[in-house]
Amino acid sequence: ADLGSMGYFELQLSALRNVNGELLSGACCDGDGRTTRAGGCGRDECDTYVRVCLKEYQAKVTPTGPCSYGYGATPVLGGNSFYLPPAGAAGDRARARSRTGGHQDPGLVVIPFQFAWPRSFTLIVEAWDWDNDTTPDEELLIERVSHAGMINPEDRWKSLHFSGHVAHLELQIRVRCDENYYSATCNKFCRPRNDFFGHYTCDQYGNKACMDGWMGKECKEAVCKQGCNLLHGGCTVPGECRCSYGWQGKFCDECVPYPGCVHGSCVEPWHCDCETNWGGLLCDKDLNYCGSHHPCVNGGTCINAEPDQYLCACPDGYLGKNCERAEHACASNPCANGGSCHEVPSGFECHCPSGWNGPTCALDIDEEFGLVPRGSGHHHHHH
């Protein structure tokens, strides 16, 4: 299955010394039957390659059985003894190359794993003699060494030295999490992204770090305009404040009143809560007509009645809706200088004799200087 890997176990062989050029069985690598005890193996050097087996931690290592964590091998690295460049930058480059299918450092074995790294492990390293004519079998084994221990994912290499029965091996190991995997077990996934499924980078521990303008566990929620009332508004993209139905304003903190609401406001959408002295569904009925219009004249007292309605209580001698009419207006003989008084709906009218004018016939008509008060007159005046 194309699962990808969560991490890599890396082994870099630094040196192998097989001074006598012999196999673990005591035979010579060239297979001529001689042993070191019968004069050494001088004719032909071993063609040494390494096989690596990685498995679960075993207090007592058993060299047989499946390599449950993975397996790897090198090509032929050299003869009886050889030295390879130490692990480091070269190893890192080789690992990158091996992952992209490029040429790999021959002494580097990379074993990918697709499970949470358990930290404890058993490593079995075998040196073998390559023989074109035969398949690998125990007869070609040069050396087998093992190590059981613990290792945490990190960039630093850990050195191991083994002195076996016939050969000495020096190698370095490390575990590294794959790109996008984090934690001591390499099973925490975080791949930076900037799309609808999340807007985040990853910190050194593999936690999602939301980009500016985004929040939430997966960084999918937009951060709205500062001050936006999130009870009545929100946003799908950063910096906006889009109001819910019934709310308005830059911060969605103003309710929309009932349409046509005149002298009112709202606390809840579609309400029309009237201002003082206003009533009706649209707050357009004046409950204090007296206070806002002062309709009563001639000392009349205004009394608020139904919305938009009022009554005037008129003083003695006045009547009409607004106390605008005088009752028996001529009874007080208001017309001077012989003017005759006539009651009309608005009060009284004086009909002035010739030479007099004004509301009560008190103004003399002088041909030169205009109107001046005098004792007798000619004109009449309507009031």
Epitope: F189, R191, R193, N194, D195, F196, F197, V237
Partner: antibody
Amino acid sequence: EVQLVESGGGLVQPGGSLRLSCAASGFTFTSYDIHWVRQAPGKGLEWVGGISPADGDTDYANSVKGRFTISADTSKNTAYLQMNSLRAEDTAVYYCARNDYDVRSVGSGMDYWGQGTLVTVSS
Amino acid sequence: DIQMTQSPSSLSASVGDRVTITCRASQDVSTAVAWYQQKPGKAPKLLIYSASFLYSGVPSRFSGSGSGTDFTLTISSLQPEDFATYYCQQSYTTPPTFGQGTKVEIK
């Protein structure tokens, strides 16, 4: 070669259930999202939901939230769409698609699609 | 949800014509817009991602532009195999939404 193959479509009665499968191959399953997109007969494309197989993160369209569930089995390289309480308006061809993304650019693209599987909800 | 409005809904053109399809987002979606081509009975194919990046294997006669709310897909010289329906899609915020499609027909 990257391949996505849907299966599990068919005729189902309103209120019934169906499980669609999307078998993936040719790529690292855990490195991409898998999304479900549907297309009603003669209509346009509608996103249904998606999953990130590596961490199990899912998201859904409002129209299917609470009724549909997306899951993934990384050992089988397969994503699933469990559809419950099906309605006539869920009738469509259902596609699974791989969504690729790169933090260096805003947005993403569904670069590989399956052939689609028809789901018909009718009594 | 962000609405993606494509125009025109259909167009007739001849081989060799320059064709432009526009897509307008109801809100700012940065450059997170992809374009797809779909032929009858087939799955959609990705043409453009992140507004202007040509997907691998797509002919260079296809190009995309735009940012914010206004986006354009251009086919510089229409070929017989380009007669299909084209969809824009915003991938900036969840849920990702598609335009209603533009059908390009032979004149």
